[in-house]
């Protein structure tokens, strides 16, 4: 069977600007191997060009001039001896859009342009974005290699230039960010930030970029306790909080980490296997009792480590006062005052607004104090009779407040009235 001129190539090809495409192609032509063997030359031309004069877009003939604008970008791929006319187009440009025809030449007898099978090339705007590759998850403090590549791009044409931008890159040398690969050591604060790779062909207007949001795994770095939306100050891994006895308390513990740490509250300073009193970051105490003084620990447990903070709770109360009450006894007038407060209050007696301190040098009065449980007692003994109506007061105070009470001793009256007068400091 006599071979004929045949060309198998797709009718149309679309490629995005700046990218590459391989157009598969095969051909046949009439040739008998017992003939002499002049070289086989093949050519791709722009449609409408005259093969004898025109510059080619691609050829295997070293003596034919190639169009400068396609030089190095349009290349024959494959073995033409095996009738492979596949065409590789790199760094496609808008001006490459158009029709192309294939031509074969061998000796004097074979000179043929396959005009009936033209290749239509359409170059469209670049919408392809580069891919950023790295091993996930990114872990804080662990160096990770990232690479940026554009699917469909190839070595043809001017080199690609890269630029990386993002908050995570701030400490890097600018030269490092111009490579298609970079090594990043992410920090906790880089979590959720954007990293962009931009690609551009030198001398061309074609640019494309991809932005990824970094997902950085990190253990808790800090732990904060909030009371009513305000952070408690921390000194040596301890927060201090004075709370009024009986007050409701709602605390929120927070330890930023990714993935989120498991937060729990413990009574006191717990062992690692202790049972939490709250399995969330929220600790609620309906009424703070003095028994809760000492504190609580908030622990943030995370696959990459744990962190904890101690809350030193000091429960305080304003002084509560019972008395004074007075009675006549053998040694004179005996007045008693009972009080409780946290921290323990100071107490003073007054006689007609004059302070009575310690014991009288003349032995006219004597003060005794004792304590039992949360209550403390003080007694005042006044020797001698009353010359006139007399006001006896006792006052208890601590740093949070004070309270005073007084009794009016009426001359010649046995019933002694008392009144408690609260007072703030």
């Amino acid at each position: 069977e006599k071979p004929v001129y045949e060309l198998q190539v797709q009718k149309s090809v679309t490629v995005q600007e700046g990218l590459c495409v391989l157009v598969p192609c095969s051909f046949s032509y009439p040739w008998r191997s017992w003939y002499s063997s002049p070289p086989l030359y093949v050519y791709w031309f722009r449609d409408g060009e005259i093969p004898y004069y025109a510059e080619v877009v691609a050829t295997n003939n070293p003596d034919r001039r190639v169009k400068p604008e396609t030089q190095g970008r349009f290349r024959l791929l494959g073995d033409v001896q095996k009738k492979n006319c596949s065409l590789s187009i790199g760094d496609a440009r808008m001006e490459d859009t158009g029709s192309y025809f294939f031509r074969v030449e061998r000796g004097r007898d074979v000179k043929y342009s396959y005009q009936q099978n033209k290749l239509n090339l359409e170059v469209t705007a670049l919408i392809e974005k580069p891919d950023i590759h790295f091993l996930e998850p990114l872990e804080s403090g662990r160096p990770t290699r990232l690479s940026c590549s554009l699917p469909g791009s190839c070595e043809a044409g001017p080199p690609l230039t890269f630029s990386w931008t993002g908050n995570a890159l701030s400490p890097l040398d600018p030269e490092t960010t111009r490579s298609s690969e970079l090594t990043l050591t992410p920090r906790p604060e880089d979590h959720g930030t954007n990293l962009t790779c931009q690609m551009k062909r030198q001398g061309a207007q074609v640019t494309t970029e991809r932005t990824v949001q970094l997902n950085v795994s990190y253990a808790p770095q800090t732990i904060t306790i909030f009371r009513n939306g305000i952070a408690l100050e921390i000194l040596q891994n301890t927060s201090y909080l004075p709370v009024l006895e009986g007050q409701a308390l709602r605390l929120l513990c927070d330890a930023p980490s990714n993935p989120p740490a498991h937060l729990s509250w413990f009574q006191g300073s717990p062992a690692l296997n202790a049972t939490p009193i709250s399995n969330t970051g929220i600790l609620e105490l309906r009424r703070v009792r003095s028994a809760e003084e000492g504190g609580f620990t908030c622990r943030a447990q995370h696959p990459l480590g744990f962190l904890q903070i101690f809350l030193n709770l000091s429960v305080y109360s304003l002084p509560q006062l019972l008395g004074p009450s007075c009675s006549w006894e053998a040694e004179g007038l005996h007045c008693r005052c009972s009080f409780r407060a946290r921290p323990a209050p100071s107490l003073c007696w007054r006689l007609e607004e004059k302070p009575l301190e310690g014991n009288s040098s003349q032995g006219s009065f004597k003060v005794n104090s004792s304590s039992a449980g949360p209550w403390a007692n003080s007694s005042l003994i006044l020797h001698g009779g009353l010359s006139s109506d007399l006001k006896v007061s006792c006052k208890a105070w601590n740093i949070y407040g004070s309270q005073s009470g007084s009794v009016l001793l009426l001359q010649g009256r046995s019933n002694l009235g008392t009144g408690v007068v609260p007072a703030a400091l």
């Epitope: 604060e189 904060t224 909030f226 009513n228 939306g229 305000i230 952070a231 100050e233 004075p242 009024l244 929120l252 927070d254 930023p256 989120p260 969330t280 970051g281 929220i282 304003l318 949070y400 407040g401 703030a424």
Partner: antibody, heavy 116, light 106 residues
Amino acid sequence: QAYLQQSGAELVKPGASVKLSCKASGYTFTSYWLHWVKQRPGQGLEWIGMIHPNSGSTDYNERFKSKATLIVDKSSSTAYMQLSSLTSEDSAVYYCAKTFYYFDYWGQGTALTVSS
Amino acid sequence: DVVMTQSPSSMYASLGERVTITCKASQDINSYLSWFQQKPGKSPKTLIYRANRLVDGVPSRFSGSGSGQDYSLTISSLEYEDMGIYYCLQYDELYTFGGGTKLEIK
């Protein structure tokens, strides 16, 4: 530098609802409480409520419990306040603010006008 | 609810004068009190927190004092840019603002 960018002025009809936004930048959004404060024209400041973005925990001024709903979108670092059943009494400037040891950053405010 | 009573509601003062604004809480607020300054059309700005702590960057002529239920803000020597409205805020039990004090220059 922390920055709170609030949405633009709103003009809405009585009975309608509105959603005001507060976009945070320059700090770790999830780590700090965000508050909303109301200021009627020529009047003082009134605290509406607060939300902790990380835990979703909220607290409201009793007066606003049925009026305001606070939510956050962690992915966009944005806090929202939805105000419902609007009346002329709700016409005010609404501020968002963040706290740590104190109110350290405020948004520029969103003016809401409720009028038919 | 904690009620904050601020006084005076407005005042005039001369440049260089010492100015004091007070706030009284309806109960002990454990020094959980802040002071704010607000200029017309602007957001409030914190001056003092925890009753007496000065915020970084705030001029030292501003000071806060008080405990229990009674608190005050003092401007030691009034300057022109100090005019505005001042608010106290308690944050012991949720948050309550005082009614404000409008400070104007004589």
